[in-house]
């Protein structure tokens, strides 16, 4: 099997308050089976931003149709950016486990920062 890699191409993403930010994440393999989640920050206090498996995330949409069985693009868009959204965002692959899924691999992260306001 090809070893799964999580690719987040942008190290830094400059965003504008009120606009929509796109955070890119692709995987190189569909295996092992399990969901991809997005977090802001690391460690026990990290904030869940999006879970493809369940939950309601009104400001988040996916770039691709995650119901495609061969989908490898887990990029997301976050609308109506505010200063509170700054931070480093990680896409994280989990493998299935019982009773809980197990973190398998994380992307390197994309730092979201505020850019200069348009003049």
């Amino acid at each position: 099997e090809e070893e799964l890699q999580m690719i987040q191409p942008e190290k830094l993403l400059l965003v504008t308050v009120g606009k929509t930010a796109t955070l890119h994440c692709t995987v190189t393999s569909l295996l092992p089976v399990g969901p991809v989640l997005w977090f802001r920050g690391v460690g026990p206090g990290r904030e869940l931003i999006y879970n493809q498996k369940e939950g309601h995330f009104p400001r988040v949409t996916t770039v691709s149709d995650l119901t495609k069985r061969n989908n490898m693009d887990f990029s997301i868009r976050i609308s109506s950016i505010t200063p509170a959204d700054v931070g480093t965002y990680y896409c994280v692959k989990f493998r299935k486990g019982s009773p809980e899924n197990v973190e398998f691999k994380s992307g390197p992260g994309t730092e979201m920062a505020l850019g200069a306001k348009p003049s």
Epitope: E1, K53, T67, P99
Partner: antibody, heavy 118, light 108 residues
């Protein structure tokens, strides 16, 4: 409540075609992948086809690929199964099912009976 | 592709524990579910994602997995649990859904 209601079944002759429909309600149809599953009399379940939420991607087992076609109309909240060149072996109850995020099934319709007989 | 193998029948007395096994597939690439079907009715999903129980399914139904075998456990079996039970799998390697042959659960 999630509701899936199949229609279009009936008696057809060998070699004929038939199109089944599945009307969905109680959930955001355009956000869910869907599948068709059938059950021949006294037999087990057989997966026939799956389709992504947007309808662009379809999936089939080798047993029906090229003969059955799954499609959907999200504006009508309806799933379809076009079946061509039917044979007696296609006699079964046909169910539509909603897929979970990982392509298992969480809700099923009541089924529609297709009988292929001369 | 892969095959899922179940015992054709399982018998249990009311109040006892029934276990139905399903083998095949690959833990690395396959998710499993269990579907209950009573005579003349449509299937009902009792377990999905190996061990997740839908909110409207009684707590006596549980799922577990070990290697290439998954198990449906019904604790304190009731007469109304008599039905056919199918395991189903989705293989992320082939994008294919598969069903086991079904197990007839008889409540004595």
């Amino acid at each position: 409540d999630v509701q899936l209601v199949e229609s279009g079944g009936g008696v057809v002759r060998p070699g004929e075609s038939l199109r089944l429909s599945c009307a969905a309600s109680g959930f955001t149809f355009s956000s869910n992948a869907m599948s068709w599953v059938r059950q021949a009399p006294g037999k087990g379940l057989e997966w026939l086809a799956g389709i992504s939420a947007g309808g662009s991607d379809t999936y089939y087992p080798a047993s029906v690929k090229g003969r059955f076609t799954i499609s959907r109309d999200n504006s009508k909240n309806t799933l379809y199964l076009q079946m061509n060149t039917l044979t007696a072996e296609d006699t079964a109850v046909y169910y539509c099912a909603r897929e979970t995020w990982n392509h298992l099934f969480d809700y099923w319709g009541l089924g529609t009976l297709v009988t292929v007989s001369s | 592709s892969y095959e899922l193998t179940q015992p054709p029948s399982v018998s249990v007395s009311p109040g006892q524990t029934a276990r139905i096994t399903c083998s095949g597939g690959d833990y690395y690439s396959t998710y499993y579910a269990w579907y209950q079907q009573k005579p003349g009715q449509a299937p009902v999903t009792v377990i999905h994602s190996d061990d997740k129980r839908p909110s409207d399914i009684p707590e006596r139904f549980s799922g577990s997995s070990s290697g290439t075998t998954v198990t449906l456990t019904i604790s304190g079996v009731q007469a109304e649990d008599e039905a056919d039970y199918y395991c189903g799998g989705y293989d992320g390697r082939t994008y294919i859904n598969t069903f086991g042959g079904g197990t007839k659960l008889t409540v004595l």
